[in-house]
Amino acid sequence: SERCDDWGLDTMRQIQVFEDEPARIKCPLFEHFLKFNYSTAHSAGLTLIWYWTRQDRDLEEPINFRLPENRISKEKDVLWFRPTLLNDTGNYTCMLRNTTYCSKVAFPLEVVQKDSCFNSPMKLPVHKLYIEYGIQRITCPNVDGYFPSSVKPTITWYMGCYKIQNFNNVIPEGMNLSFLIALISNNGNYTCVVTYPENGRTFHLTRTLTVKVVGSPKNAVPPVIHSPNDHVVYEKEPGEELLIPCTVYFSFLMDSRNEVWWTIDGKKPDDITIDVTINESISHSRTEDETRTQILSIKKVTSEDLKRSYVCHARSAKGEVAKAAKVKQKVPAPRYTVELACGFGAT
């Protein structure tokens, strides 16, 4: 067969679908690899061909579009399963071609099973809600295109195993779930089961997402440097190890990049010749406020090092702050007996 532009196996799009539920899978060629859409390709005389390789097999085979009740079908650039079976798991390829052009991409499809509480190997999207922020909503995800707007599905919401009914601050409103005032206790997995009719059959779609209640922007503050501070002086003798922690608290801010760095005499540690190591650790509160600690370490400090300026800097979307550490050379204790003897004129 003639050459085909092969985009390989697109593992970035690991598609997971539930067993015994409908699934619609768009050919990734038009979404991520080609600069034109299916309609343009179709009107230019290009044909979209689908085939697959079963799990643990090497053999590429055509997809059987003649199954009872059209269980698998193709519509434009979408491959439909109505519904999926466990053994539909495998690598699927869509190929766009005519006599002079060919382009193809493969992607993995995994059909997964869920338990009685909707737990499964499915990777879950995370939706962040601000704590005590007023009404916020989540929407049942990835159900577009399954049924026309004329069809009114029923939607049932669950938190973990339990149907959401008579919850104090969580109200199902069709495709949306409203949180009147989000609290830490609202953290968890939420599932919507969407039921809709199609061609004399009833189908169900199950979608689970994780809700994480995070710090509110109303309470967000610029970074706070807890250490170094004015109360601690790092007094060292030459030859000793100098350890200075920089501990910074960051309020949770959606999509904010939190940064902590040290400067020594106004330069980044990488830009100076002394032997400095910096170790970072990060911890999070229940609302995803972040505490970052960077420990600056000089194994054998010199008297020159003890004269330098050590400044901890921190930055978030809320602002930038800096704090200098108080570093000084320890004054050696007087050798008391000798000095006394000298004082009395002893030789």
């Epitope: 015994d20 099973q113 338990d115 009685s116 149907k163 089961v193 199950t206």
Partner: antibody, heavy 118, light 107 residues
Framework: QVQLQQSGPELVKSGASVRISCKAS????????MNWVKQRPGKGLEWIGR????????NYNGKFKDKATLTADKSSSTAFMQLSSLTSEDSAVYFC???????????WGQGTTLTVSS | NIVMTQTPKFLPVAAEDRVIITCKAS??????VAWYQQKPGQSPKLLMY???NRYTGVPDRFTGSGSGTDFTFTISSVQVEDLAVYFC?????????FGAGTKLELK
Amino acid sequence: QVQLQQSGPELVKSGASVRISCKASGYAFSGSWMNWVKQRPGKGLEWIGRIYPGDGNTNYNGKFKDKATLTADKSSSTAFMQLSSLTSEDSAVYFCARDYYLFYFDYWGQGTTLTVSS
Amino acid sequence: NIVMTQTPKFLPVAAEDRVIITCKASQDVSNEVAWYQQKPGQSPKLLMYYASNRYTGVPDRFTGSGSGTDFTFTISSVQVEDLAVYFCQQHYSSPLTFGAGTKLELK
């Protein structure tokens, strides 16, 4: 298409136990709940409980907690209900019925008639 | 347990009559009520769920309505094949409970 095929009628002595089966086909047995419902003439329908074959999780109607035991065998796509310490009150038609997490029953078995004799 | 009180118990009908069956829940069940039809010697068949949603394949002469505690099931024009027992069921909470049934019989 979905089918639930139940075992045949049973005539058993008072005090004994019985096991009724329900074989499912046409859908993913592991991924839906299987319910059991009792029907006595003039007594309407009573929900006994349900089992999720995928993980064996069960919910019972408190009234039947000590009477019925629900199990499932994924390899044969069959659900079972064992009824113990039988009395004449247990004489009834028993149905298995599927639900997809939603507590209403879209497919039913044909029913198994249990007669308890003294 | 939620008690579902269904009325009437018996309903004499003639072909093409409009039929209304009611079901009252002992507490609020939102709109989570299903309706079933059972013919002699057969298993029940799902007709409606979530009070007003017709199950696939169910003719549109069957409709349902209601929320909270009061629910109505209507057959707009009864056909001979509709002679059966009809049950309501709350699918709001466990234990699931049914109404006692309404038997449609010829006048």
